[in-house]
Interface confidence: low
C-alpha cells in the first residue's frame, strides 16, 4: 500500500455489517483483505467486489476497487486482497506518461519509416526511419535484407510510447 492514501482512495465509511468477518489485529495490524476497526480492537474484512487491501495495514477503510473505463477490458476482477486489473482494448494503448487514458494506436508508420514493433496494450507501434537497402513498401524487410546504417545515421523512433 502507498503510505499516502487520499480520501478518494478510500471506500465510503460503512458500519461493519453482520456478515463481515472480524478477527483481532496482530501487533496493531490487520491482514490483507481487512481493515482495522475505529477502536483498533478488530480486523474487519473488506467487501468482495467493492473494496480491498493488499498488505498488512492499519487502514480505517479498505481501498475502493477500480472500475475499468470504457475502452478497457477487465483482466481480473477486484477481490478483497487485489484491485481490479484493467487493460486497454485491442488497438489501443496506455502511454507511460499519460496513464489516465487509452489512446488509439496508429495504423501505420509515416512515409519513409518502417514498423519494428506492434501495437500492444502498453505501447503504440514503433517506427524507425527507413534506411537504404530496405523495401520501399511499409513492410519490414524480408529475412535476408539488412539495414546497413551506422550509429551515425540513426533510425530515429517515431513512436510516442516509451
Amino acid at each position: 500500500e502507498s503510505a499516502l492514501i487520499t480520501q478518494q482512495d478510500l471506500a465510503p465509511q460503512q458500519r461493519a455489517a453482520p456478515q463481515q468477518k472480524r478477527s483481532s489485529p496482530s501487533e496493531g495490524l490487520c491482514p490483507p483483505g481487512h481493515h482495522i476497526s475505529e477502536d483498533g480492537r478488530d480486523c474487519i474484512s473488506c467487501k468482495y467486489g467493492q473494496d480491498y487491501s493488499t498488505h498488512w495495514n492499519d487502514l480505517l477503510f479498505c481501498l475502493r476497487c477500480t472500475r475499468c473505463d470504457s475502452g478497457e477490458v477487465e483482466l481480473s476482477p477486484c477481490t478483497t486482497t487485489r484491485n481490479t486489473v484493467c487493460q486497454c482494448e485491442e488497438g489501443t494503448f496506455r502511454e507511460e506518461d499519460s496513464p489516465e487514458m487509452c489512446r488509439k494506436c496508429r495504423t501505420g508508420c509515416p512515409r519513409g519509416m518502417v514498423k519494428v514493433g506492434d501495437c500492444t496494450p502498453w505501447s503504440d507501434i514503433e517506427c524507425v526511419h527507413k534506411e537504404s537497402g530496405t523495401k520501399h513498401s511499409g513492410e519490414v524487410p524480408a529475412v535476408e535484407e539488412t539495414v546497413t546504417s551506422s550509429p551515425g545515421t540513426p533510425a530515429s523512433p517515431c513512436s510516442l510510447s516509451g
Epitope: 519494428v116 514493433g117 514503433e126 524507425v128 530515429s156
Partner: antibody, heavy 115, light 101 residues
Amino acid sequence: EVQLLESGGGLVQPGGSLKLSCAASGFTFSSYAMSWVRQAPGKGLEWVSSIANGKMTQYADSVKGRFTISRDNSKNTLYLQMNSLRAEDTAVYYCAKRWNRFDYWGQGTLVIVSS
Amino acid sequence: DIQLTQSPAIMSASPGEKVTMTCRASSSVSYMNWYQQKSGTSPKRWIYDTSKVASGVPYRFSGSGSGTSYSLTISSMEAEDAATYYCQQWSSGQGTKLEIK
C-alpha cells in the same frame, strides 16, 4: 514483470566465436524490437545491433560482418552470434528491449577476448 | 558518425542543490535518451525522447534540449541520485559521474 536474462559470455581467444542468448519474460516478446548494447570496462554504452519484431536487422559499423543478431519468438529468446572476435570486443553485453529507446535491460554477460 | 560529448565528466553536489549536466551532439539530432547506471548494475531508462521521464523516476528529474544541445536537470539533489548518467541515441556519451558531497 519484465525480465531479460543474458547468458553465453566467457573467455575466448582472438579470432574465436561465442553465441550469446537472452531469455525474455513478462511481456509479449514477439511484439517488440530487441537490441544488444555493450559496455567496455570503465566506458560508455555502445549500441551493437537491433532486430525488429519481423526480421529487419541493424548493426553498428564496428561489428558488421562479424556479428549476427537473431531471435526465436517461440522460445522468447534473442541471440547474438559473435565471430572473428577481437580484443576490443571485450565488454559486458546487455540485452535490451526495443529498437533504440531501451526501456528494460538485462543484467549483462561478460565477454573477454584475450590470448 | 554522430559523437555525443557529456560534461562535466565528474561532478559533486550537496543535498538540495540543483544539478544540471549537458550532452552535446556533433551534429543535430531529433531527440535524446538518458540512462542512469549505478556501480555494478545495468543501466536504467531515466529520460526518453528528450523530456519524458520514465516510470518510477522521481519528479525532481527533467530533461530538455534540441538540435545539438541536451541537458538533464535534478531540481534538488538527493543521496540516491549519485550515479553515472549517460546520454544516448545509438552509442552513448562517456557519462557524467554524479557524486554526493
